[in-house]
Every structure is written in C-alpha cells, then in structure tokens.
C-alpha cells in the first residue's frame, strides 16, 4: 500500500517495483523499468559507462550536464557528459561540477557569495512569514521580466541548483523540488550506484560539499551491502 511505501519520515530509495518494474498491484507510478528518479538517471560507474541521451541538464546527474558529445556535432544528439572541474572552460552553470559555477567562460568556485544581486530570469519563491499573497506565503514580485533578488533560500521551490543560494542545491522533496543544504563532513549522503540500481527518491539529499565525497563510513565496512552507511568524507 502507499502508506508503507511512501511514509515520509525518512529519505526513501525505493526498490523496484516502485522504481518501475512491472507487476505490483499497489503501485500506480508511471515509469519505465530502470529509470531513476527524479531525473538523475545515469549514475554510471567508470567500468560500466553507457552514454545517456538527454534533452536538458536536469535529466542528468549532479555531476553531469547535457550536451552534444562532439563540438559542432549533430545538435539533435545530446548525452550526459561529465561535469567540468574548476578552471575548465564552460558556457553555463550546469557544465561546472557541484560547488562551482560558470563565470566568464571558466568554472570557478561558488564559495564566494557571488549570487547576491545577480540578475535572474526566474522568480524565486520565499518561504518567509510575510504573509502577503493570495496563497498565504510571501512571494517576491518583479518590476519587469528580470529582477534583482537573493537566490532561493532553504525550503524555496526551485527548478535547478543555480536557483538556490550558495551552499544549497535543488533537490526533490515529496513531489516538488526545493533548495536544500549541501551536505557537510560527517553527514549521511546517498551513494548512487549504477543506472537502474535504485528507485523513486521522494526525499533527495544534496551532494557532498567542496572537498568531500560520499563514501562508506569506515566502521560500516563489515555491515551487509544493503545497510552500509555512506557519509561525506574528506578526499
């Protein structure tokens, strides 16, 4: 039943059939076998790399972006490519690895509060207590199609991580996407293995912060595969 599957008190990595395999009578998720949710559908390992076709960056993993594999190649054929590290060339934020952004064609670290006062196309909705709008929550308004505003704060609805303030990423929460904190050292993280290995993530965690990677906690090496705890650890 849904209540056993979607109990929201913890982050869920649901196994098939909710990940999309056939035949579960209690499931009404419309999914194809092997698809991971919510859009990070290609967490390959190096030894099992398969190019994943995409139409936009959001269809790729947090360490990837969507582009044509060859410069000047067929624009209709795009795949998820590995993100660009600091000081590599870029054309947009999504090309740069987590913790970086694209500035003047180069991936640079985002730990300076570079987003303050930046002109943005998207209106970020605030979860503040200034109850001034029809729906009862505060909302920043705009004088024109572009506006100056601070990036989305924790809990703000977002479309992509570049909508969120420094130190936050855009991740799934229930059936929506909100800005959540990038994980700090010692915090539990989600290690995505290869494509098709996990199901519907109702509560997605952010990635580990700068200089950290998601690894099995040392004292959990002896635990069974399924119960291994991953935490953000120094490289």
């Amino acid at each position: 039943t849904l209540n056993s599957v979607l109990n929201s008190n913890a982050i869920k990595n649901l196994p098939p059939p909710l990940g999309g395999a056939a035949g579960h009578p209690g499931s009404a998720v419309s999914a194809a076998p092997g698809i991971l949710y919510p859009g990070g559908n290609k967490y390959q390992t190096i030894d099992n790399y398969q190019p994943y076709p995409c139409a936009e960056d959001e269809e790729c993993g947090t360490d990837e972006y969507c582009a044509s594999p060859t410069r000047g190649g067929d624009a209709g054929v795009q795949i998820c490519l590995a993100c660009r590290k600091r000081r590599k060339r870029c054309m947009r934020h999504a090309m740069c690895c987590p913790g970086n952004y694209c500035k003047n064609g180069i991936c640079v670290s985002s730990d300076q509060n570079h987003f303050r006062g930046e002109i943005e196309e998207t209106i970020t909705e605030s979860f503040g207590n200034d109850h001034s709008t029809l729906d009862g929550y505060s909302r920043r308004t705009t004088l024109s199609s572009k506006m100056y505003h601070t990036k989305g704060q924790e809990g703000s609805v977002c479309l992509r991580s570049s909508d969120c303030a420094s130190g936050l990423c855009c991740a799934r929460h229930f059936w929506s996407k909100i800005c959540k904190p990038v994980l700090k050292e010692g915090q539990v993280c989600t290690k995505h293995r290869r494509k098709g290995s996990h199901g519907l993530e109702i509560f997605q965690r952010c990635y580990c912060g700068e200089g950290l990677s998601c690894r099995i906690q040392k004292d959990h090496h002896q635990a069974s595969n399924s119960s291994r705890l991953h935490t953000c650890q120094r490289h």
């Epitope: 919510p38 959001e58 209106i123 729906d135 609805v157 996407k177």
Partner: antibody
C-alpha cells in the same frame, strides 16, 4: 496573482469521459508537485491523484486507479485529470491543489448521471 | 493510510467565547526535515476549503489572529480565542506527510 483555476466540469453519463484542466499562475508551477482532491456531496474530501514536478511520477487513489490519468504541461502551466469510465460515485467538486505551500483552486463540479 | 480523528464532531459556541477542536493522527506527522505536515481548514457551503493553519501553528495570510494551532507528533489542537458569527462552518484537519492525503471527519461549529 497566485492562483489555480479549474475548468472542464459538467454533467456526463456513466461510462463516459471528461477531462479537467487546472490553470496555474503567479508561481513556479514546474517546481511543484500537484494534486487532485475531490469532495462528493455530503462527504469529506478525498485525495485523488498526484503528479511530480516533472510529470514523471504519478500516484492514484485506489478508487480511481486504472480509470483516471493525471498529467501536466509545464510549458502551459496547466494540470489535467483525464477521467474515463465515469461512475455515479465520481460525482464531486474536483479541486486541484499545490503541495508544500498548499494552495487550492475554487473547484469544478462533475456530475455523473444517466 | 493515516487516520485522522477529530473531536468533538460538533460544537455550539456563544459569540465571544473560546472554542477548541482536537485532531489526532494515527502516526507522527513530523518529517525528517523538522516540519510537521498538519493543516487546518474551514469549509462553508458552496465554497472551496479556506486554509487557516499550515504546519501545525502558522496562520495563512488574512486569517484573523483569534485562530491558533498547536500540538506536535500525533496530537493537535485548533483554538478560536473568541468565536464570531462568521466562524461557523465545518473545520477539518488534514495531513500531507504521506499519500494519500487524509482528512479528519470534520467538526461542525455553530453559534448558540
């Protein structure tokens, strides 16, 4: 202004189909999960279906599973509910609802009657 | 499904007097994000639900401050400090932490 406006309700015979629409405005529609909830005459509210922000994931109440289909068009800021094989017990006011920062529309009445 | 149980089912109140409605959930509505996904709303004939309180104790815009919510975990209360004639209707609690969203049976509030 921030609002949801449902349309498409009406009187329909049992076994027939109807498609409801919900037009969203004033907020980042494509970032929110959206739900349909209904209220039958003299009864309490009943949750019907949910669709994720990107349209990839959908869940339904057992009472409508296999008959109703929830969908969305983020380019048009619109949520849909395709209702097939309608029954008398589907008669209700149907509301679309935004999750997290809960917002409801004014509802549209569906009457299934021969 | 999470069962939401409201008491009392009806309440007759003198204008200016306080009123209190209880809602108990079959399991905790506290999420790991620290929020408790419990709402209160008012239903009047022919009108859509009018949401009063979100996340246990936060008032929606333009909701008079005579309405307040409290509680945690599985036990919640809606209080009206001084009932007014316009407050009549059916009050419901609702949880959205888990699918399907579920609702209390409703508490009919009327004026004496």
């Amino acid at each position: 202004q921030v609002q949801l406006v449902e349309s498409g309700g009406g009187v329909v015979q049992p076994g027939r189909s109807l498609r409801l629409s919900c037009a969203a405005s004033g907020f980042t529609f494509s970032g929110y999960g959206m739900h349909w909830v209904r209220k039958a005459p003299g009864k309490g509210l009943e949750w019907v279906a949910v669709i994720s922000y990107d349209g990839n994931d959908k869940y339904y109440a057992d009472s409508v599973k296999g008959r109703f289909t929830i969908s969305r068009d983020n380019a048009k800021n619109t949520l849909y509910l395709q209702m097939n094989s309608l029954r008398a017990e589907d008669t209700a006011v149907y509301y679309c609802a935004r999750e997290l920062r809960v917002l409801w529309g004014q509802g549209t009445l569906v009457t299934v009657s021969s | 499904d999470i069962v939401m149980t409201q008491t009392p089912l009806s309440l007759s109140v003198t204008p200016g007097q306080p009123a209190s409605i209880s809602c108990k959930s079959g399991q905790s509505l506290l999420h790991s994000d620290g929020k408790t996904y419990l709402y209160w709303y008012l239903e009047k004939p022919g009108q859509p639900p009018q949401f009063l309180i979100y996340e246990v104790s936060n008032r929606f815009s333009r909701v008079p401050d005579r309405f307040s919510g409290s509680g945690s975990g599985t036990d919640f209360t809606l209080r009206i400090s001084r009932v007014e004639a316009e407050d009549v209707g059916i009050y419901y609690c609702m949880q959205s932490i888990q699918l399907p969203w579920t609702f209390g049976q409703g508490t009919q509030v009327e004026i004496k």
